[in-house]
Interface confidence: low
């Protein structure tokens, strides 16, 4: 006869595991018992169980609780055993010894393999400026065993470097993500992903990129330099910036206070039924907790009873 | 380190036979498992079959009775028989070494492309 088993049972940590032991013998000889010990190198034999033909199951105290036979039916050739709730410590060799009559006895290995799936965490870098040079983005760190692979999927330009810490019975990798920060990656994902052979689908953590910036102020609303004349009613200025946090605005006239009647309305300046008071240096000031920007413009209101012409300067200041 | 050299895939007709072969050099010494993975297009890499040192075999359910695997512990080779070939057999098949190291395969060829058409 001879015995039939798996050179490596492969379970993911808590499952249970099944350790195959199985007795193809010739017609008339019969299992008396099978015995299941650790095998591990450098240590003692130490047995999990006994699978008597007559008595039943026996477990050792270490074992209590833990070991089973498979549900019935079952074959009095078989001499497998589940091992319930599969931890790290229970990784490493096993040794199955079937006593038959009339033939002997016969023994088998094998290793039992315990998966931990990993349980990733990711980490963003000190916040992002435009402007800065390479910067750490995010850090994505698991540990499992055997070693998880961490890689990233992003549709941002940029680097990666990855280390490995083996511990005794796991390893944990850390892979760093860095980029040049551009006002063009807020808002875009950037996926830690985590495979590993215990896992049924990879792991994915997003964190979604902030880039702080603060974009050139300008004034819109001089374009057409003969609408700004005396009488004329909706005249309005609009600063334009953008920035990540979106900025403030405020507006201040240089050689003086606002003349009365000018209502500020966050970004826009409006003016009431124009008139030569109104002429003078106009200030949009922007700003977020990264920087700020400055943009002057001069209105020249015409008064046409005044036969002059409009002079319109546009100056910008950061 | 282990070096992985595959060969022998193709195309060919369902019902038919391939043999693919792969031969081991570098740290031979430390092999334990050697094996043979497949992968086909949008799916994950799976076990087919898998040999000790002594012999003994594991085969997946889905190429029971039609694959054998074969090793030359002298030769460092390990041989993939595949008779009654189906058009889901089709992927790239990849010899594997397992090291008793590490405990997992962590020696791979550089694959070679089945394809089984009906």
């Known amino acids: 006869g001879e015995l039939e088993t798996s050179d490596v049972v492969t379970v993911v940590l808590g499952q249970d595991a099944k350790l195959p032991c199985f007795y193809r013998g010739d017609s008339g000889e019969q299992v008396g018992q099978v015995a299941w010990a650790r095998a591990d190198a450098g240590e003692g034999a130490q047995e999990l169980a006994l699978l008597h033909s007559k008595y039943g199951l026996h477990v050792s105290p270490a074992y209590e609780g833990r070991v089973e036979q498979p549900p019935p039916p079952r074959n009095p050739l078989d001499g497998s055993v589940l091992l319930r709730n599969a931890v790290q410590a229970d990784e490493g060799e096993y040794e199955c010894r079937v006593s038959t009559f009339p033939a002997g006895s016969f023994q088998a290995r094998l290793r039992l393999r315990v998966l931990v799936p990993p349980l990733p965490s990711l980490n963003p870098g000190p916040a992002l400026e435009e402007g800065q040079g390479l910067t750490l983005a995010a850090s994505c760190t698991a540990e499992g065993s055997p070693a998880p692979s961490v890689t990233w999927d992003t549709e941002v330009k940029g680097t990666t470097s990855s280390r490995s810490f083996k511990h005794s019975r796991s390893a944990a990798v850390t892979s760093e993500f860095h980029l040049v920060p551009s006002r063009s990656m807020n808002g875009q994902p950037l996926t830690c992903v985590v495979s590993h052979p215990g896992l049924l689908q990879d792991q994915r953590i997003t964190h979604i990129l902030h880039v702080s910036f603060l974009a050139e102020a300008s004034v819109r609303g001089l374009e057409d330099q003969n609408l700004w004349h005396v009488g004329r009613e909706g005249a309005m200025l609009k600063c334009l910036s953008e920035g990540q946090p979106p900025p403030s605005y405020n507006w201040t006239r240089l050689d003086g206070p606002l003349p009365s009647g000018v209502r500020v309305d966050g970004d826009t300046l409006g003016f009431p039924p124009l008139t030569t008071e109104h002429s003078g240096i106009y200030v949009c000031h922007v700003s977020n907790e990264f920087s700020s920007r400055d943009s002057q413009v001069t209105v020249d209101v015409l008064d046409p009873q005044e036969d002059s012409g409009k002079q319109v300067d546009l100056v910008s200041a950061s | 380190e282990v070096q992985l050299v595959e060969s022998g895939g193709g195309l060919v007709q369902a019902g038919g036979s391939l043999r693919l072969s792969c031969a081991a050099s570098?740290?031979?010494?430390?092999?334990?498992?050697m094996g043979w993975f497949r992968q086909a297009p949008a799916k994950q890499r799976e076990l087919v079959t898998s040999i000790s040192p002594g012999g003994s075999v594991r085969y997946a359910d889905s190429v029971k009775g039609r694959f054998t695997i074969s090793r030359d512990v002298a030769k460092n080779t390990v041989d993939l028989q595949m008779n009654s070939l189906k058009p889901e057999d089709t992927a790239v098949y990849y010899c594997?070494?397992?090291?008793?190291?590490?405990?997992?395969?962590?020696?791979w060829g550089q694959g070679t492309q089945v394809t089984v058409s009906s």
């Open positions: 570098g740290s031979i010494s430390s092999i334990n498992l």
């Open positions: 594997a070494a397992e090291s008793e190291r590490t405990y997992y395969f962590d020696s």
